[in-house]
């Protein structure tokens, strides 16, 4: 079965700076991956990057780099909003489309009691979807 | 037809701010992005930033920030872009283009407005 | 930033001719890049974008190829009408970034 994973780590050196990293656990080929924040992409959540595999990115603040890290995962830093923790509580979320699998979308966020420089652990919350 | 009709020429003094527009025609104005660009005189073209109309979202070319503010009235399906603190090294030709996130590239451009800063 | 290199500032061709005009990324970019282009006193214009994929209403003279870091716009039997600047775009990384140009002039 196909699983999605997500991580949110804050810089050890800048307590403001956040980068997500978003993956797909699976057989297929990745048609798309869309990155939103305050809950799933199209249910509340506020899109913030969109990667394709061979067309690029497209982004929106406060996403400041969407990049490919491999083939299945990607990278998204956040820009630094001068707060201190500015998206402790806030929840991230990564859908992957995949061929044949379809649409599947997890949900993570940094644990209040995070030491800087750690990823919260992978929070994967599967949604299937049927493209 | 699609049309992106900016607004027309400005001359403008160092340190002042000027605001150009965008007014989409011809499409649902809520369906697309609008980047901006601009265009040196002789030199070649440099992405400034885009704005979703749906939503308000924008994102910027660092180089730009604190220039450049993006915005957007639904109600007239008009952008705007406000560029503030001109000095001689913004006077350019300033470009609207449409962004077809289906193909992903600029699909339509602006007529472009010319901006020149002189005291 | 992705720098875009247009190494030909200026092509000279004439009617009937065949030229490419090349453009190479700083990095791959995959497919990312579209080709726009610019006749005197007027806006750019999309002419091929994917790399390859032709817009709605370009003749089909008109040909993009390359993916990675090597990309080149190919224009077959020139008219006159091609008189015009050329820039490719890469669209992979933020921020956008577009070549410096190649002006096309006909003999």
């Known amino acids: 079965t196909p699983e999605v994973w997500v991580q949110v780590q804050m810089e050890a050196t800048e307590l403001s700076s956040f980068t997500v990293h978003c993956g797909f656990l699976g057989p297929g080929s990745i048609s798309l991956v869309t990155v939103s924040w305050g809950g799933p992409d199209g249910a509340g959540g506020t899109k913030l990057a969109v990667l394709h595999p061979e067309l690029g990115t497209r982004q929106w603040a406060p996403a400041r780099q969407a990049r490919w890290e491999t083939q299945s995962s990607i990278s998204l830093a956040l820009e630094d909003s001068g707060a201190s923790s500015p998206f402790a509580n806030t929840t991230f979320c990564c859908k992957f489309a995949s061929f044949p699998e379809g649409s599947w979308e997890s949900c993570g966020s940094l644990p209040p009691s995070s030491d800087p420089g750690l990823s919260a652990p992978p929070t994967p919350v599967p949604i299937l979807r049927a493209d | 037809e699609v049309q992106l009709q900016q607004s027309g020429p400005e001359l403008v003094k160092p340190g002042s701010s000027v605001k150009i527009s965008c007014k989409a025609s011809?499409?649902?104005?809520?369906?697309?992005?609008l980047d901006w660009m601009k265009q040196s005189h002789g030199s070649s073209l440099e992405w400034i930033g885009a704005?979703?109309?749906?939503?308000?979202?924008?994102s910027y070319n660092q180089k730009f920030k604190g220039k450049a503010t993006l915005t957007v009235d639904k109600s007239s399906s008009t952008a705007y872009m406000e560029l503030r603190s001109l000095t001689s090294e913004d006077s350019a030709v300033y470009y609207c283009?449409?962004?077809?996130?289906?193909?992903?590239?600029?699909?339509?451009w602006g007529t472009g407005t010319t901006v020149t800063v002189s005291s | 930033d992705i720098v875009m290199t247009q190494s030909q500032k200026f092509m000279s061709t004439s009617v009937g001719d065949r030229v490419s005009i090349t453009c190479k990324a700083s990095?791959?970019?995959?497919?990312?890049v579209d080709w726009y282009q610019q006749k005197s006193g007027q806006s750019p214009k999309a002419l091929i974008y994917?790399?390859?994929t032709r817009h709605t209403g370009v003749p089909d003279r008109f040909t993009g190829s390359g993916s990675g870091t090597d990309f080149t716009l190919t224009i077959d039997n020139v008219q006159s009408e091609d008189l015009a600047e050329y820039f490719c775009?890469?669209?992979?990384?933020?921020?956008?970034?577009f070549g410096g140009g190649t002006k096309l002039e006909i003999k």
């Open positions: 283009a449409r962004w077809d996130s289906n193909s992903w590239y600029f699909d339509v």
């Open positions: 011809g499409y649902t104005f809520t369906d697309y992005n």
């Open positions: 704005m979703s109309p749906n939503n308000g979202a924008t």
């Open positions: 990095q791959i970019v995959r497919t990312a």
């Open positions: 994917s790399a390859s």
């Open positions: 775009l890469q669209h992979w990384n933020y921020p956008y970034t």
